[in-house]
Every structure is written in C-alpha cells, then in structure tokens.
Interface confidence: low
Amino acid sequence: KSPVFGPQEVSSVEGNSVSIKCYYPPTSVNRHTRKYWCRKGASGRCITLVSSEGYVSSNYAGRANLTNFPENGTFVVNIAQLSRDDSGHYKCGLGINSRGLSFDVSLEVSQGPELPNGTEVYTVDVGRTVTIKCPFKTENAPKTKALYKKIGQTSVLVIDSRNYVNPNYKDRIRLRIPGTGQLIFTVVIDRLRLSDHGLYLCQAGDGSNRDEKNADLQVLEPEPELVYEDLRGSVTFHCALGLEVANVAKFLCRVNSRETCDVVINTLGKRDSAFEGRILLNPQDKDGSFSVVITGLRKEDEGRYLCGAHSDGQLQEGWPIQAWQLFVNEESTIPRSPTVVKGVAGGSVAVLCPYNPKESQSLKYWCLWEGAQNGRCPLLVESQGLVQEQYEGRLSLLQEPGNGTFTVILNQLTTQDAGFYWCLTNGDTRWRTTVEIKIIEGEPNLKVPGNVTAVLGETLNIPCHFPCKFSSYEKYWCKWSNTGCQTLPSQDEGPSEAFVNCDENSRLVSLTLNPVTRADEGWYWCGVKQGHFYGETAAVYVAVEEKKVAGSRYVSPAKADAAPDEKVLDSGVREIENKAIQDPRLFAEEKVVADTGDQAGGSRASVDSSSSEEQGGSSK
C-alpha cells in the first residue's frame, strides 16, 4: 500500500471549490521530491494537471494550485470553479505520475441545473480508445442502431448496424450489439484523433419511439510536462503509453521547427547522432512503459519531446503519445568538467566526475556506454571497490578531491578503451555526466618495467621514470586492489637518462619491497598528483616466485621480453570485452578479484634496477 494518503472520494457541485489534502511520510527525500495532481485517462495513464514544480495545465489555469508543506508532510490541491467536466479519477502523488507513490482520488462534481439532461461526458487522450455506451428500450432491440456526430445543426452518420462506416473512422471503429436481454449497445473508437472531439448522438430505432443518448467526447492532446534540468546534467523521460501498445515499437522524438518530430531514439535501433554516447532507452516493463535517459545536457537539447508507439518507430497521428517541454538551465549547479579526455596507448587518463556535493555519502559509479540496440551502460567500477574483472589492475575510483567531485583513473590504455563513459551515483540522477575518452598518438610520460618477477625473501626495487615537467608534482607508488590503490612509501632517486628530449635530467621514483612476501604479489601503480588532483599513472604487475637455485634469478632473454606477454593479455582482454558487449552484465557479479600471479600472462620479466636505461627499454 502506498504511503501517500488522501481522500478516496471527493464530491462537490459545479461552481464550488475543493481543497484536497494529501499526506506523505515526511522523510527528507519525500519532503523535497515533486508532488503532483494528475487525471487518469481511460487507459490508466495519468496526465499532470498541477505540480509542485510550477506546472499548471491549460484547463486548470487560473483556478488551481498545489502547495507543499514539507515540515508536516502534506500538500494541498485547491481547485476552484468546478465543472462537471472535472468529475473523474485522479491521483495525488510524489515523484513521477506513472511510477510514483500515489493515492487514488475520485472526484465527483454534480451537474448544475443549466446542463442538458443525460449527456454522458467521455474524456480521453489522443491515440487512446473510447467506448460509448448507448442504452435502448426492448421495442427497439431489433431495429437499426447508429451513432451520429453533431456538426453544427446537422448530424453526420458515423457508424450503424447495417455495416456503414464513415470513411473518417475506417479501420478504427466498431459497433457492438450484445446478446438478448442486454439493452445497451456500444461503439468503440480506437486511436482517437483530435478531430474526433465533439458531440455524438446514439440512436436506436426511428420515429417517435426511437431511443437517443447524447455523448460529449473530449479528446485531449497531452499537455507537455515542463522539465527543468541543468546544463551538463541529465534528464529521464518516463513513458507510460498503456497496455494496448505494450508490444508496439517505442520511440522518443523531438519536435522541430516544421512541427514534425525527429526521432531521437527508438526500439528499432535508430538513434540521432547528436545523442551518441549520452542516451539510453531502458528496457520496457511488461506494461509497455519505458524510460529514456539523456546525459551531458546541452542548450541545444531544449525543446518539446514526445514519446510514443508505432510499428514504424516514429510519430503517427492517432497513436498514443506523452509530451515534455525540456528547458536547460545555463546557470547550472553542475560544474564544468572536460567532456573529452585524451590519453595515449599504454598511458592513462584521470577523469573528474561531478556529483551533488550534498550527497557526499552516496555510492559513486562509472559505466561504459554501449551503443548497440537501445544502448546500455554496464558498470565498470564503484566506490565500494568492486571492479569488473577485465579492468583488474588498471581501473580505480577515488573519492578525491571530494566536495562534489570524484576521480576515476584508467591506465594501460589501448585503442579499445576509446568511447563514452558515464559518471553516476545512487543519489541525484540529474548529476549523471558523460565523458569521451579518445586515444591519441604519443608515448606515456611515466615509464615503468613491463612486468616484474620478484623472489620471495629478497629485495625488489621498482623504478618509475618521470619527465622534468612533473618535477613539481607529488610522486607516489601505490598497491592496487579492487577497493582502491593504497599509497606506499617510495624514494625519489634523482636524475635518470630515460628521457632524452628534456632540457634538464629526467627523474626517477622507486619503490622498494624488502623483503618480498607472497602478499606483495599484484598490481602496483606509479603516479603523479597535485594536491588531490591526480595526473598520469603507470602500472606494473609483480609476480612473486620461490627462490631458485643459484643463477636462476637471471632470466632468459625470451622471458625478459614482456611484449608477447602483453599481447596475450591484450587479446584476452579483447575476448572478454567482446563477450561483455554481447552480454554486458557478464562480469557484473561484483565478486572480489583475487590477486593471482597469472592475471597478466604466465611469464614475468625480472628487472635489474641498476640500469635506468634498461628499465626504460622494458617500459610499455
């Protein structure tokens, strides 16, 4: 049962006002989330009439408001100048109309004496279905049944029981006559158009004994819900079109200056290139509802968006739609951060991800956008540490610098890492952002040995060369684990000859493991940073082996060559990624990655730290 509570039924008379109070649990989230009052259509979809974000529909303009009282967990909907047209089923709720916490309210407005007697009012959304009920007396049971539309002073035949169908209603109307004993016939009109709006007349029989019933059909074009989002932020369009179209192709389109609607994304695989890397169409629920997420909002994304259903995956008249008017606020609370980050093959990137600073305790995530079909974004890493297996040793999410920004570091880059990545949290969804990683020509600035085999109980020295441009940066070594990278004590060893293109001597920072233990096996990162802002990193895998007989410390040239090793690893990663593309959650079990010695291939190069040139030569 929904925790939102309010009056189940409200009744009044025309011209009067009502004040409907709805209660909700006054949790912090509830107090600040959107409140709405919406009207349920024939299919069950609920069209917003008034909301706490300032939206008021045209037929409520000047006579309704919604006031939130967060301190005591209530909101009040005031509606004045009631008319019989206001009778119907409504919801007061929190969040999103189609999916939020809500309470059903039935509003019944009795008709005033000035209204003609017996007119049934049907209020239905465009694209939906209406069933008009037409009662008749027993004596007219065998006689012709018909539905007319009143246009001015004339009545135009729409359908009758002699199989006539007006061309304007072809293939979307049927007249049903029940079995004996039931004194009512129905006319069902599907895929309603705005032009179907108007007064209809049911008729059974002819002459003075004929039965007549007036029906007022009001076909509503969906009022666009006003959506205000921040520049660089994210928007989610939740689309609930009803069970009638659950198995029909879905789309989101944007209305252009010609008042046609350009497809942004659809379930048939079409996607506007302007949204590449920053859009997902989420899977349908069984009721046919779906949602579209767009990140990295730009000013040019503003406009009127429609979601709908049609076998062609694009807008067609007479099919159900839902509408939004998106406004992108340029005075954004979301800070500027690079939308493109460049790295070189073998090198690294450090991506800054913004999040709502009020939600510092939220879980942070980083996912890889995949464009196949409707788009997906399988998670690669999260702040509680779990990393996808194929990213072991080269991906870490850091809480630094904090206060609204976290950092994701990815190293050992290959061309396969080029693509779009999303920063997100389990908090404010509007703070989702997109960054594109591009792999460019060049050499990594930091140089470390390819892979290292350490001998149990002995001393291991791992050098990391950095160019003079990093001389003012803080240098560090850390041991990677699936929960982060633990900084280790390291030693700045002064000049090195590894870089010859530098005016002053390049430098060296070393990590010493003494004595080497089994626990030392794993990935180590050398990196540079300035304060809490991270720069480049380089990774080296240390394998630990038992002490061998004398002389075995010096490995054969074949074993020292790390390059084939890396190719094996690379092709292995490619294989894994190919599987991940087919089934992106393949590696999403978030299981703890074991630090095993064979993660990067079987052979490891031993590094003699006495020669900086030799180390430079074995760097990636």
Epitope: L94, R99, L280, P283, Y365, C377, L424, L586, A588
Partner: nanobody, 130 residues
C-alpha cells in the same frame, strides 16, 4: 561480503498461504532492488516478483504466473524483502531464490532477467501439496 538469507519456506497445502522473507546484510549493504525468482526441478529460473526504489519512488513487479496471488513488500530500512504467497498451487512448488542489486535501476536493467541481478541467496524450498 554481501549475504542474502531466505526464510519461511516449507510445506503448504493447495489454496494456503506462506510468507517468505529475505534479509540482506554485509558491507553496509543498502540495495536498490530486491526480488524473488524460483526454479522448479528441470526448469529454468523464473521471475516471481521484484521491488525497487529510488528515493521516494517505489516500483513493484509481479510475474504473470503469480499475478493477483503473490505480493512483494519490504521493510522501512529496505534491507528485508517479503513475498506473501496466497492461493498457492502445486505448480508453485520450487526453490525460491532472493536476489538483490545495488545498481541504479534505470541504467539498462530488466528486473525479470536473472543476469541483471548482482547478488543471490542460497534459496528456500516451497512445496505445495495437493
């Protein structure tokens, strides 16, 4: 280590009721979604029901075969989920597995797909006798 522990399974007569519970614990675990799947001998794992939430918004899903008979709910903290089974039938006999997820649920997840759930319990057996 995240743990999901199911309880409440057992023998029940056709037409009777049963309430299953699933408690999540470990690593300050606060899931976005919890759900129930079942697996009868020789059959694939079948979606039963799920509940997911984000802030003040709650979504409940129920599989077609149990619609109108089973309901899913959770405790206020969101770490325990319940499956209320009413009007049970012999075909409801199965091992019932609890599943949980900490992924933001509107990022390309279909709750009916077992692959899209990160954590699983060991299961509790429900036997419906005729």
């Amino acid at each position: 280590e995240v743990q999901l522990v199911e309880s409440g399974g057992g023998l029940v007569q056709t037409g009777g009721s049963l309430r299953l519970s699933c408690a999540a614990s470990g690593r300050t675990f606060s899931p976005y979604a919890m759900g129930w799947f079942r697996q009868a001998p020789g059959k694939e794992r079948e979606f039963v029901a799920a509940i997911r939430w984000s802030g003040a918004t709650t979504y409940k899903y129920v599989g077609d075969s149990v619609q109108g008979r089973f309901t899913i709910s959770r405790d206020a903290a969101g770490n325990t989920v319940y499956l209320q089974m009413n009007s049970v039938k012999p075909e409801d006999t199965a091992v019932y597995y609890c599943a949980a997820d900490r992924v933001p649920k509107d990022i390309s997840i279909d709750p009916r797909n077992p692959k899209d759930w990160d954590y699983w319990g060991k299961g509790t057996l429900v036997t419906v006798s005729s």
